[in-house]
């Protein structure tokens, strides 16, 4: 199976677009969008903190941490109306992230 | 990183049996965790997976027959309703993408009158 | 459902020869295919994940290939110690799946 110029190969993913808005002090705001190729039951999301293809039920029940979206060693928790989660870092330092 | 099997004892059928997974190293909620059985000669069969939520996915021969829970520190593996077909060593793995990079040593389940 | 059917079940090789062993998908399983080595009394080993991929700390005569639905493990100048059971398993999707295995002898 040859893949043509362009092409992902199933189940992977690919960064199209990085924007960071680093303007409000003490916070970088980034939008990322990605091109994926997710194989049937899968869906475009995020893990360890790179896009990848997940169990598309994920997204529809909005149980973003059961894509591990956080690097190993940071805890994964629910934004309180299910918008998105945050990763917290050992250290106590915390990123959130919201899904549009 | 490490993970470790224990309850593995000799049954009589029909009496419920809970095996438990404990990691060493690492946080199960960083990682989809699995049960695996292997039949003495035989070779591997998986039981099913636990997400962080709680959310669990079986083999279709498996549904009904084993319930897979965890707690913040343990993941475990009941078998319902053993018969001597459930005879074997159960491994615990666990998984990102799919594909198994860490087991446990495995624990000897034995179903006999 | 997926089902892996794993050739030969078994094979004889000599030290420093060329084992190959198969294993066939029933369906494209889109290289989502891993290799495991296990020892008598021991758990599996991860050797090989997305087909070719091999694993930190294993040997590289281990090596893997294939597409759609066949996939080949090969262990090129075999040693004593690669005298096991090597199971190929797809996760393409659930539930996942072995194959039977290959029991690999060494003379």
């Known amino acids: 199976q040859f893949l043509k110029e362009g092409q992902l190969a199933a189940g992977t993913c690919e960064i199209v677009t990085l924007d960071r808005d680093s303007s409000q002090p003490r916070r970088t705001i980034a939008r990322q969008t990605a091109r994926c190729a997710c194989r049937k039951g899968q869906i475009a999301g995020t893990t360890r903190n790179k896009p990848s293809c997940v169990d598309a039920r994920i997204i529809k029940t909005k149980q973003w941490c059961d894509m591990l979206p956080c690097l190993e060693g940071e805890g994964c928790d629910l934004l309180i109306n299910r918008s998105g989660w945050t990763c917290t870092q050992p250290g106590g330092r915390i990123k959130t992230t919201t899904v549009s | 990183q490490s993970l470790e099997e224990s309850g593995g004892r000799l049954v009589t059928p029909g009496t419920p049996l809970t095996l438990t997974c404990t990691a060493s190293?690492?946080?199960?909620?960083?990682?989809?965790m699995n049960w695996v059985r292997q039949a003495p000669g035989k070779g591997l069969e998986w039981i099913g997976i636990?997400?962080?939520?709680?959310t669990t996915y079986y083999a279709g021969w498996a549904k009904g027959r084993f319930t897979i829970s965890k707690t913040s520190t343990t993941v475990d593996l009941k078998i319902t309703s053993p018969t001597s077909e459930d005879t074997a060593t159960y491994f615990c793995a666990r998984t990102v993408s799919g594909y198994f990079d860490i087991w446990g040593p495995g624990t000897l389940v034995t179903v006999s009158l | 459902e997926l089902d892996l059917t794993q050739t030969p079940p078994s094979l004889s090789a000599s030290v420093g020869g060329t084992v190959t062993i198969n294993c066939l998908a029933s369906?494209?399983?889109?290289?989502?295919l891993a290799w495991y080595q296990q020892k008598p009394g021991k758990p599996p080993t991860l050797l090989i994940s997305?087909?070719?991929n091999l694993e930190s700390g294993v040997p590289p005569r281990f090596s893997g290939s294939g597409s759609g639905t066949d996939y080949t493990l090969t262990i090129g100048g075999v040693q004593a110690e690669d005298a096991a059971t090597y199971f190929c398993?797809?996760?393409?999707?659930?539930?996942?799946?072995f194959g039977a295995g290959t029991n690999v002898e060494i003379k």
């Open positions: 636990i997400y962080p939520s709680g």
């Open positions: 190293g690492f946080s199960l909620s960083s990682y989809y």
């Open positions: 369906e494209d399983i889109y290289s989502a």
């Open positions: 398993q797809g996760y393409s999707s659930y539930p996942l799946t």
């Open positions: 997305g087909t070719s």
